[in-house]
């Protein structure tokens, strides 16, 4: 078998009003804090040249960073949202911990590093957009790895 | 400021084509995407499709596959809708419009271009 | 694809009146829902933007609610300018779709 069929999520976990709800209101609280609207982090740069089917690996990654470098070092903010939708997030990384690929993935480490670089470059409020844009997360994990 | 200029009015012959053109200006051009959205005289809103100016991929509405051709050019930030094959219930405005395509709302419009198709 | 009902397709109302304007997707599209209104002769102008954010340049007597399938537009308080038709557009993963239309009209 292929490596990548552990890349998969329940649908359940994007069906869960309460949760789903919740990880939108966060994104919309951060993106009112968010002025810098001509960067986009989440779009159509980040899947620049990597096939659908190695998608759900790339989301993957995008997501541990986020969990990691963004909502942990501005988990007091964005409450009471914060503290449900982190441990939501936790679950589908953890879900995916056995996602890898066995190609090449020189494209997907490019565009996370492109990620990563920009938010870095940004500071604070690279880690608000990030924030901010949990719901473009969400629907991204949600299209690739169902 | 931010804003998009589209070409002038046309009149088409049924079966002809139109090629509409839509310039980008006060923003970056590759960033954002272009969508094409029609409106017939005392009509609704009808989207057409979107293309990207960062990477040229494109998107069409099922009714229009295969008689729409959407092109950027990025040295002049500039966006073209072809429409082939016009026939009489293609006379409508023809709105260019900026957005990211990835669940992105239109958040500037041209101000359209009427084409008529009349034999 | 998913179709967008809004309701009613004309409303009569004056000026000061409080106006709802709904929209339906035929499926659950979580916050992903836009509003613009339109004058005749004129583009259409971006008022709400994921279901509830005030775009820029946009009064502050629109607001938008819903989540899911369910989304309503609300005016405060009708002004002189606010007689204009009304579309709701669901904001899709490179595809969009937009509702019938609201007519605004003078009471």
């Known amino acids: 078998l292929p490596v990548n069929t552990r890349c998969k999520l329940e649908v359940s976990n994007f069906q869960q009003p309460y949760i789903v709800n919740r990880t939108f209101m966060l994104a919309k609280e951060a993106s009112l804090a968010d002025n810098n609207t001509d960067v986009r982090l989440i779009g159509e740069k980040l899947f620049r040249g990597v096939s659908a089917k190695d998608q759900c690996y790339l989301m993957k990654q995008v997501l541990n960073f986020t969990l990691e470098d963004v909502l942990l070092p501005q988990s007091d903010r964005f409450q009471p949202y914060m503290q449900e939708v982190v441990p939501f997030l936790t679950k589908l990384s953890n879900q995916l911990s056995s996602c890898h690929i066995s190609g090449d993935d020189q494209n997907i480490q490019k565009n996370v590093r492109r990620l990563k670089e920009t938010v870095k470059k940004l500071g604070e409020s690279g880690e608000i957009k990030a924030i901010g844009e949990l719901d473009l997360l969400f629907m991204s994990l949600r299209n690739a790895c169902v | 400021q931010v804003q998009l200029v589209e070409s002038g009015a046309e009149v088409k012959k049924p079966g002809a084509s139109v090629k509409v053109s839509c310039k980008a200006s006060?923003?970056?051009?590759?960033?954002?995407?272009i969508s094409w959205v029609r409106q017939a005289p005392g009509q609704g809103l009808e989207w057409m499709g979107w293309?990207?100016?960062?990477?040229?991929?494109?998107n069409y509405a099922q009714k229009f596959q295969g008689r729409v051709t959407m092109t950027t050019d990025t040295s002049t930030s500039t966006a073209y809708m072809e429409l082939r094959s016009l026939r009489s219930d293609d006379t409508a405005v023809y709105y260019c419009?900026?957005?990211?395509?990835?669940?992105?709302?239109?958040?500037?419009w041209g101000q359209g271009t009427l084409v008529t198709v009349s034999s | 694809d998913i179709q967008m009902t809004q309701s009613p397709s004309t409303l009569s109302a004056s000026i000061g009146d409080r106006v709802t304007i709904t929209c339906r997707a035929s499926?659950?599209?979580?916050?992903?829902l836009a509003w613009y209104q339109q004058k005749p002769g004129k583009a259409p102008k971006l008022l709400i933007y994921?279901?509830?954010s005030l775009a820029s340049g946009a009064p502050s007597r629109f607001s938008g609610s819903g989540f899911g399938t369910d989304f309503t537009l609300t005016i405060s308080s009708l002004q002189p300018d606010d007689f204009a038709t009304y579309y709701c557009?669901?904001?899709?993963?490179?595809?969009?779709?937009f509702g019938g239309g609201t007519k605004l009209e003078i009471k």
């Open positions: 419009a900026r957005d990211r395509g990835y669940y992105d709302a239109f958040d500037i």
């Open positions: 006060g923003y970056t051009f590759t960033s954002y995407g």
């Open positions: 293309i990207s100016a960062y990477t040229g991929n494109t």
């Open positions: 499926e659950g599209i979580y916050h992903w």
């Open positions: 994921k279901a509830s």
């Open positions: 557009q669901q904001m899709g993963e490179w595809k969009a779709a």
